[in-house]
């Protein structure tokens, strides 16, 4: 018995579902009550979910797998694992027998698109050209290990000096934090990428560094140029600091986090004492940096409906502020495609290809093309609705008159996160059904 | 219109020294790294190294760390690149190119047109 | 040193082929350029940063890859195509480029 698995492994991102997808080719006559079907973790042996005597056995893997019931009689044996994990990366079987047997193995690739990367300087004033000073980039909750580059204003690669850490929460995804050692000149500019070597995601900042004093008089609030970009449902540090002189203590310090537009307040600190979120309890400062100048903010859990700008106010003597900007952003799923018709399409007949994706915000841009790279333009209708989260669904419609046999493929493009989800179909013979029956 | 225009040929003898100029046009010179690439007849590209005119900072490959001096003149927008003790395997175009783009995305987007170096004795 | 060795050296095709040249870096960087270069001219960008176009390049052109492996397309091959192509990246110093990959049009 011939059974079917993609040769390259499927991505999945973290908290997304993945389908692994198995096939075999029924004959005539045949009934469900012949199938017997196990999936299995490929080294361990461990079964993860199985159809018996006619009937779905369940998902022994956690209670987060299933079948695709009304497939299975045209033979489509693949499963559905939901949620997915950095632990559940690995090879799958797929043992399919009837009368004969067939097995083979799929491999799942976890991957989770890294933050947009913060940049922080030790020392952070009064600095002058000749210093010694280390930038540290940092960005968080990625898989696999991501490969790090650091180049200086015009693309000149920074290797010397730099050392690079990568750190596993407990869901196994890595933050990294990459530090750059660098004697300033009179001015310069420093730049760290951060890559995922699977999903080919690039996340870049830079920081400008001009040595020189600080004017006196106002506080100088210092917050990042870049908008923070934070992944929905992770937490985000809106960064603020300012220069405490000597002899500084907490008991002068009035410090206000507020919305800047509506002024709604955020988060506070005066009297010496933090006086807590003013904003759903998902607010925290870092008391232990307050006396160094660290005003940062940290937001946990971020939603879409935080994204704007948040006014970090300091006041000691003199008083200062500044604002930072919240972009919230989602990945895209990858996208699922459906024909209509789907079946005895010939060549001539028009067909109507839809591209989902779901759950990625902002908004997405979709591209089409044809096999060859020629972008489809024409007869193409793109939907994206708004879930109450404020996540998007996309759907793009492309209606095209079928060839001989061709290729159709979506691109949803998170244009925040940089991060591309592509679908393809091919259709090919003459006539044909869809899906193909193996 | 962005313009590198370079030197015209040379006739060296082995050990002397060339200097090829790149006189630049169209574009802020200051703003962007100049590049030297050199091509031996029927070779690939071979990169010797490159100045910041505006920090006046360089870099070169290793293979011709001692034997290669890049130099700019803000003034006329022109870079320099001198090659001294030259040997006949020195015989190639020598390239000017401009380093172009933004963080962290850089690719060489204008050339000169070469400067043959004939190495002969 | 990043070595980058291209395959093939030499390839002769003909008009309305598929073309793929592919390019191993001997360690992972960060992006990749592709510059062609014709007979008694200068090298002209083709592909900036693995996968972008560079202004005025026909479309059949497209690039793909990460960490060391890359690839440059034609799609659908003209006769004007004939050039020598080269990868180059600047990830760590010294800057290189790839041997090349001459296409011949039969």
């Known amino acids: 018995l011939e059974v079917q698995v993609p040769e390259d492994p499927v991505v999945a991102l973290v908290g997304t579902d993945a389908t692994l997808c198995c096939s075999f080719s029924p004959e005539p006559g045949f009934s469900l009550a012949q199938l017997n079907l196990i999936w299995q973790l490929t080294d361990t042996k461990q079964l993860v979910h199985s159809f018996a005597e006619g009937q779905d056995q369940g998902s022994a893997y956690a209670n987060r797998t299933a079948l695709f019931p009304d497939l299975l009689a045209q033979g489509n044996a693949s499963l559905r694992l939901q949620r997915v994990r950095v632990a559940d990366e690995g090879s799958f079987t797929c043992f399919v027998s009837i009368r004969d047997f067939g097995s083979a193995a799929v491999s799942l690739q976890v991957a989770a698109p890294y933050s947009k990367p913060s940049m922080t300087l030790e020392p952070n004033k009064d600095l002058r050209p000749g210093d010694t000073v280390t930038i540290t980039c940092s960005s968080y909750q990625g898989y696999p290990e991501a490969e790090v580059f650091w180049q200086d204003g015009q693309g000149v690669p920074l290797t010397g000096n730099v050392t690079t850490s990568q750190m596993a929460n407990e869901q196994g995804l890595f933050d990294v934090h990459s530090i750059l050692r660098v004697v300033l000149g009179a001015n310069g500019t420093y730049s760290c990428l951060v890559r995922n070597p699977v999903l080919q995601q690039d996340a870049h900042s830079s920081v400008t560094i001009t040595p020189q004093r600080s004017p006196t008089g106002a506080v100088e609030v210092q917050v990042p140029e870049d908008p923070v970009v934070a992944l929905v449902g992770t937490d985000a540090t809106l960064r603020c600091s300012f220069s405490p002189e000597p002899g500084f203590s907490l008991a002068q310090l009035n410090l206000i986090w507020q919305l800047t537009d509506t002024k709604q307040l955020v988060h506070s600190f005066t009297e010496g004492r933090d006086q807590g979120s003013a904003y759903a309890n998902r607010t925290a400062l870092f008391p232990d940096l307050l006396a160094q100048g660290n005003a940062s903010l940290r937001l946990q859990r971020v939603r879409v409906a935080d994204e704007g700008s948040f006014t970090c106010f300091v006041s000691i003597r003199d008083f200062g502020s500044a604002a930072v900007s919240l972009q919230v952003a989602a990945p895209y799923s990858k996208p699922s495609m459906t024909l209509e018709p789907n079946k005895d399409l010939r060549p001539g007949d028009t067909v109507t290809i839809t591209c989902s994706s779901y759950r990625g915000y902002p908004e997405a841009e979709v591209f089409w093309q044809d096999g060859q790279g020629v972008p489809l333009t024409g007869n193409v209708t793109t939907s994206q609705m708004a879930n109450e989260q404020g996540l998007f669904d996309v759907h793009s419609v492309l209606r095209v008159v079928l060839g001989a046999n061709g290729t159709y493929s979506c691109l949803v493009r998170n244009p925040v996160l940089q991060q591309d989800a592509h679908g393809s179909v091919t259709i090919t013979g003459q006539p044909m059904t869809f899906p193909p029956e193996a | 219109e962005v313009q590198l225009v370079q030197s015209g040929a040379e006739v060296k003898k082995p050990g002397s020294s060339v200097k090829v100029s790149c006189k630049a046009s169209?574009?802020?010179?200051?703003?962007?790294?100049i590049h030297w690439v050199r091509q031996a007849p029927g070779q690939g590209l071979e990169w010797m190294g490159y100045?910041?005119?505006?920090?006046?900072?360089?870099d070169y490959n290793q293979k011709f760390k001692d034997r290669v001096t890049i130099t700019a003149d803000k003034s006329t927008s022109t870079a320099y690149m001198e090659l001294s003790s030259l040997r006949s395997e020195d015989t190639a175009v020598y390239y000017c190119?401009?380093?172009?783009?933004?963080?962290?995305?850089?690719?060489?987007?204008?050339w000169g047109q070469g400067t043959t170096v004939t190495v002969s004795s | 040193e990043i070595v980058l060795t291209q395959s093939p050296d030499f390839q002769s095709v003909t008009p309305k082929e598929k073309v793929t040249i592919t390019c191993r870096a001997s360690s992972s960087v960060s992006y990749m350029n592709w510059y062609q270069q014709k007979p008694d001219q200068s090298p002209k960008l083709l592909i900036k940063?693995?996968?972008n176009l560079a202004s005025g390049v026909p479309s059949r052109f497209s690039g793909s890859g990460s960490g060391t492996d890359f690839t440059l397309t034609i799609n659908s091959l003209e006769a004007e195509d004939a050039a020598t192509y080269y990868c180059q990246q600047w990830s760590s110093n010294p800057l290189t480029f790839g041997q090349g990959t001459k296409l011949e049009i039969k």
């Open positions: 169209g574009y802020s010179f200051t703003s962007y790294t």
């Open positions: 940063a693995t996968s």
């Open positions: 100045i910041n005119p505006n920090s006046r900072n360089t």
């Open positions: 190119a401009r380093y172009s783009g933004s963080t962290p995305y850089w690719y060489f987007d204008v």
